[in-house]
């Protein structure tokens, strides 16, 4: 049950996360907010109404409205959480499970082409899982991961945009490109 | 008045199965955390199993692919299907109500459960 | 999984003298502690949670301390009727468990 119902959620390497609550309104009704780290099995953050809020580190922090924030993701953040949220009388009111997953943005990605053989190469150097697209005055080409090598015959001279995504950032590059009618660099 | 009774217990032979009942009255049942606690011969308490209000099960590493706890809210009952049973699973099994997921606030009376051949 | 160890194993005291049980955790876990009573024949009883919180229905004389690693139970002024084991349980980590337990004997 736990994984099936779980939020898929991303976060950047090195960037803060929330991990927000969906279709939860705080109340005076609730007395204890609960964050566990499935794999470590264990209770990360806590908050108790009237009393003083428990956190594991100091790279979590638990807002009233029951969010936590982990702050610099690192690798081992990866994981399956889990919110519990309880009334004054104990009962639990509403659970939720957040599937964590952590990516490292990708890079500006890096276009070079040669005239000699009008063939243009377009890269990425990091991130996690990058898709490539390649385009040529605003028509896409191809799609690749992280090395895209396109030989264009159309014309001598275009604009080209390589762009650079995954699930936690975008960039993208543009290089107008213009070759003598010899084919020379 | 929070009121736990617990049934099903009995003498059963290694490898043998069990379905361990919980009655529960007196509180809003589907709403609360519930857990199995077991006390040994030895007096030693070992918390089981837990389901929470919502579904989700945890167990003891021990247990875990032998014993399945489940609860029907409509008749607020609480299980404890165990199967595989070994002789270190003798014991005294309780039933607990588990406010905030955690405080065992109340107990049953208890099932006693002996495994051997 | 966490281990918790309760001292003495068994605690004499005479009728209205203070006792106080002790319950040490292998790791820090802030003050997710709750001690429970055992009558010779009974079940479990909640006393104290989350430490140092009282519970309704439980006499004044029962009180708790403690946070991190490090936790007591006390009762100021024993009565017979406190004849009994007395077990600290920790809900930090899964799987949640217990102290051996004190018992309590009146001399």
């Known amino acids: 049950k736990e994984i099936t119902n779980a939020l898929e959620t991303w976060g950047a390497l090195g960037q803060d996360i929330n991990l927000d609550i969906p279709s939860f309104q705080m109340s005076d009704d609730i007395d204890d907010i609960k964050w566990e780290k499935t794999s470590d099995k264990k209770k990360i953050a806590q908050f108790r109404k009237e009393k003083e809020t428990f956190k594991e580190k100091d790279t979590y922090k638990l807002f009233k409205n029951g969010t936590l924030k982990i702050k610099h993701l690192k690798t081992d953040d990866q994981d399956i959480y889990k919110v519990s949220i309880y009334d004054t009388k104990g009962k639990n009111v509403l659970e939720k499970i957040f599937d964590l997953k952590i990516q490292e943005r990708v890079s500006k990605p890096k276009i070079s082409w040669t005239c000699i053989n009008t063939t243009l190469t377009c890269e990425v150097m990091n991130g996690t899982d990058p898709e490539l697209n390649l385009y040529q005055d605003g028509k896409h080409l191809k799609l690749s991961q992280r090395v895209i090598t396109h030989k264009w015959t159309t014309s001598l001279s275009a604009k080209f945009k390589c762009t650079a995504g995954n699930k936690v950032s975008k960039e993208s590059s543009v290089e107008p490109v213009s070759c003598p009618e010899k084919g020379l660099d | 008045e929070v009121k736990l009774v617990e049934s099903g217990g009995g003498l059963v032979k290694p490898g043998g199965s069990l379905k361990l009942s919980c009655a529960a009255s007196?509180?809003?049942?589907?709403?609360?955390?519930m857990s199995w606690v077991r006390q040994t011969p030895e007096k030693r308490l070992e918390w089981v199993a837990s389901?929470?209000?919502?579904?989700?099960?945890y167990y003891l590493d021990s247990v875990k692919g032998r014993f399945t706890i489940s609860r029907d809210n409509a008749r607020n009952i609480l299980y404890l299907h165990m199967t595989s049973l070994r002789s270190e699973d003798t014991a005294m099994y309780y039933c607990a109500r588990s406010s905030y997921g955690e405080i065992m606030d109340y107990w049953g009376q208890g099932t006693s459960v002996t495994v051997s051949s | 999984d966490i281990l918790l160890t309760q001292s003495p194993a068994i605690l004499s005291v005479s009728p209205g003298e203070r006792v106080s049980f002790s319950c040490r955790a292998s790791?820090?876990?802030?003050?997710?502690i709750h001690w429970y009573q055992q009558r010779t024949t009974g079940s479990p009883r909640l006393l104290i949670k989350y430490a140092s919180e009282s519970i309704s229905g439980i006499p004044s004389r029962f009180s708790g301390s403690g946070s991190g690693t490090d936790f007591t139970l006390s009762i100021n002024s024993v009565e017979s009727e406190d004849v009994a084991d007395y077990y600290c349980q920790q809900s930090h980590g899964w799987p949640f468990t217990f102290g051996g337990g004190t018992k309590l004997e009146i001399e």
């Open positions: 790791q820090r876990i802030g003050t997710s």
């Open positions: 007196g509180f809003t049942f589907s709403s609360y955390d």
């Open positions: 389901i929470s209000g919502g579904g989700f099960l």
